[in-house]
């Protein structure tokens, strides 16, 4: 079992439509064929799973379980997009990468990306 470095941006601001994107990059020490990526949210001391995907290197990244996440992979880089975010979802989003196969297993956990979400102001009523 080995540790692995995972890099992700420190801060990301979600768009007015509640979409946040960031890159999660891992320093793969071996030739992994099966990779599992999990996005976790930490708020206070509570850690919850946002989404997770297992993919074969070279194949499309598919988030199952009615996910609010989408993503693409390129080499040792995963481009993650989280949708449907609201102000209450502001928090630290951690990227966790596991090289599942072949052995040895590697685990890497990023330092987290602080995602700030600002709810858009409602449009004022128009007289026109």
């Amino acid at each position: 079992c080995k540790a692995m470095h995972v890099a992700q941006p420190a801060v990301v601001l979600a768009s007015s439509r509640g979409i946040a994107s960031f890159v999660c990059e891992y320093a793969s020490p071996g030739k992994a064929t099966e990779v599992r990526v999990t996005v976790l949210r930490q708020a206070d001391s509570q850690v919850t799973e946002v989404c997770a995907a297992t993919y074969m290197m070279g194949n499309e990244l598919t988030f199952l379980d009615d996910s609010i996440c989408t993503g693409t992979s390129s080499g040792n880089q995963v481009n993650l997009t989280i949708q449907g975010l609201r102000a209450m979802d502001t928090g630290l989003y951690i990227c966790k990468v596991e090289l599942m196969y072949p052995p040895p297993y590697y685990l890497g956990i990023g330092n987290g990306t602080q995602i700030y979400v600002i709810d858009p102001e409602p449009c004022p009523d128009s007289d026109f």
Epitope: T48, D65, I94, Y105
Partner: antibody, heavy 122, light 107 residues
Framework: EVQLVESGGGLVQPGGSLRLSCAAS????????MSWVRQTPGKRLEWVAT????????SYPDSVKGRFTISRDNSKNTLYLQMNSLRAEDTAMYYC???????????????WGQGTLVTVSA | DIQMTQSPSFLSASVGDRVTITCRAG??????LAWYQQKPGKAPKLLIY???TLAEGVPSRFSGSGSGTEFTLTISSLQPEDFATYYC?????????FGGGTKLEIK
């Protein structure tokens, strides 16, 4: 209060099948990864299967892979374990467990049911 | 698979004693280790995760330490309700394996 209640255990012949159920209450079932863990008559604990929140991802040890299938019905707050081609060495108390994330961002078996006994014998 | 070895298998102690149980991992598991307590006829109960973090509601007389391959569970002052079997388990990769258990009995 978190409650997990297993059922479906019993006596089955080698080569037979059994389906275990675990009824969950006291928490939002669809928000948690769930697992089955068994305890042999010799009191050894062995992880048996894990399923993700929505059921899209499953994982098994080699000892049961291809014979056991974990599934869940989030609308019924119920976890299942379908066990086929049962062997004498599958005799055990089967527990369902809720997995929680700790500060290390890794799952732990945080809550366990009281178990259901499976006996495989001719 | 990562082998988890607990020692001792059996331990006799008295109320008020300080006891230590050891768990060794067959390879480096960093701090990804949990301890569980099981009483006769009951399900295991999570005591400690991440090697040293106490689970909710667990008394402070329980403590965990170690990292890498060597871990310990310490009970600072045994209470009558602590006589049970204790298991360690790694949560680093798959399969997640358990130690063989340590049965703590009244002397």
């Amino acid at each position: 209060e978190v409650q997990l209640v297993e059922s479906g255990g019993g006596l089955v012949q080698p080569g037979g099948s059994l389906r275990l159920s675990c009824a969950a209450s006291g928490f939002t079932f669809s928000s948690y990864t769930m697992s089955w863990v068994r305890q042999t008559p010799g009191k050894r604990l062995e992880w048996v299967a894990t399923i993700s929140r929505g059921g899209g991802y499953t994982s098994y040890p080699d000892s049961v892979k291809g014979r056991f299938t974990i599934s869940r019905d989030n609308s019924k707050n119920t976890l299942y374990l379908q066990m086929n081609s049962l062997r004498a060495e599958d005799t055990a108390m089967y527990y369902c467990a809720r997995e929680d994330y700790g500060s290390s961002y890794v799952h732990w078996f945080a809550y366990w049911g009281q178990g259901t006994l499976v006996t495989v014998s001719a | 698979d990562i082998q988890m070895t607990q020692s001792p298998s059996f331990l006799s102690a008295s109320v008020g004693d300080r006891v230590t149980i050891t768990c060794r991992a067959g390879e480096n598991i960093y701090s990804y280790l949990a301890w569980y307590q099981q009483k006769p006829g009951k399900a295991p109960k999570l005591l400690i995760y991440n090697a040293r973090t106490l689970a909710e509601g667990v008394p402070s007389r329980f403590s965990g330490s170690g990292s890498g391959t060597e871990f310990t569970l310490t009970i600072s002052s045994l209470q009558p309700e602590d006589f049970a079997t204790y298991y360690c388990q790694h949560h680093y990769g798959s399969p997640r394996t358990f130690g063989g258990g340590t049965k703590l009995e009244i002397k």
